[in-house]
């Protein structure tokens, strides 16, 4: 059957931990992505930012997992109002910020 939302969120958190833990060289060669507002609709916004990073196998699983939280199809070059379009940050920092926010959502029981 379908994975419970709490399990899916926990697995996403653990995948982000693995990414931050296994950083030998700069994540995705130091690629920059648009920062996002960590609010409602955040999963789609995060996916929209990360999907523009190509050729980075380290975040492919994260991209797939985020797509499971986003109700619509996301493609490269697509941007929602949740992006802070004047701020770009490294993928590594993006992942760290997202991880901390997701841990707080998990604590609050916001699994969707």
């Amino acid at each position: 059957g379908p994975v419970p939302p709490s399990t899916a969120l926990r697995e996403l958190i653990e995948e982000l931990v693995n990414i931050t833990q296994n950083q030998k060289a700069p994540l995705c060669n130091g690629s920059m992505v648009w920062s996002i507002n960590l609010t409602a609709g955040m999963y789609c916004a995060a996916l929209e930012s990360l999907i523009n990073v190509s050729g980075c196998s380290a975040i492919e699983k994260t991209q797939r997992m985020l797509s499971g939280f986003c109700p619509h199809k996301v493609s490269a070059g697509q941007f929602s109002s949740l992006h802070v379009r004047d701020t770009k940050i490294e993928v590594a920092q993006f992942v760290k910020d997202l991880l901390l926010h997701l841990k707080k959502l998990f604590r609050e029981g916001q699994f969707n």
């Epitope: 931990v17 991880l99 609050e108 029981g109």
Partner: antibody, heavy 122, light 108 residues
Framework: QMQLVESGGGVVQPGRSLTLSCAAS????????MHWVRQAPGKGLEWVGV????????HYADSVKGRFTITRDNSKNTLNLQMNSLRVEDTAVYYC???????????????WGQGTMVTVSS | SYILTQPPSVSVAPGQTATITCGGN??????VHWYQQKPGQAPVLVIY???DRPSRIPERFSGSNIGNTATLTISDVEEGDEADYYC???????????FGGGTKLTVL
């Protein structure tokens, strides 16, 4: 100001019972999860248990489960720890501490009492 | 149940930087809190949610949490920082709050 004050500590024989109380003041008690933490002489901190803001849930450390019971009275801003079948290894300073209540009780303890000493000895 | 491992002691000269670690399996997936406890006193929260600092705590205190290790860093250490430091997490699988064994910080 915001305060937690424990009381009820003392010397008790093994196998006997004792009830500790924690009086809260200066904040909205009913909106916080409340924990008990203990510290044996010269040892580290050990979590004892928690009761949710509305009293609907309690969780206990394995070392006290079945012997200790946490209750609260939100109308009187009080927290209680009923300790039964006390053992020598329960000897410790007992602290009450508050933590903002979410779906899960993973918040930090931002306010602690001064502690009350419980000595279990024959 | 979940286990947090801290070094029993850390020594540092005044003005230097103290680093206290807290190890746990995939601790990076958990929110970590840090407490300072001086002799005869109740613990005081110094870092919460991995890296946030209560308003009354000096900026010299900072925290991080990556992979299997959370870290409390105290820069420009002062004699008044000498204390025991404890890390803490909530273990979702057992519904238990867990403390590390504590680290005694000695200022030389």
């Amino acid at each position: 100001q915001m305060q937690l004050v424990e009381s009820g500590g003392g010397v008790v024989q093994p196998g006997r019972s004792l009830t500790l109380s924690c009086a809260a003041s200066g904040f909205e008690f009913r909106t916080y999860g409340m924990h008990w933490v203990r510290q044996a002489p010269g040892k580290g901190l050990e979590w004892v248990g928690v009761i949710w803001d509305d009293g609907s849930n309690t969780h206990y450390a394995d070392s006290v489960k079945g012997r200790f019971t946490i209750t609260r009275d939100n109308s009187k801003n009080t927290l209680n720890l009923q300790m039964n079948s006390l053992r020598v290894e329960d000897t410790a300073v007992y602290y009450c501490a508050r933590a903002p209540q979410w779906y899960l009780t993973a918040e930090a303890f931002d306010l602690w009492g001064q502690g009350t000493m419980v000595t279990v000895s024959s | 149940s979940y286990i947090l491992t801290q070094p029993p002691s850390v020594s540092v000269a005044p003005g230097q930087t103290a680093t206290i670690t807290c190890g746990g399996n995939l601790i990076g997936a958990k929110l970590v809190h840090w407490y300072q406890q001086k002799p005869g006193q109740a613990p005081v929260l110094v870092i919460y949610d991995d890296s946030d600092r209560p308003s009354r705590i000096p900026e010299r205190f900072s925290g991080s949490n990556i992979g299997n290790t959370a870290t409390l860093t105290i820069s420009d250490v002062e004699e008044g920082d000498e204390a025991d430091y404890y890390c803490q997490v909530w273990d979702y699988s057992s519904d238990h709050m867990v403390f590390g064994g504590g680290t005694k910080l000695t200022v030389l």
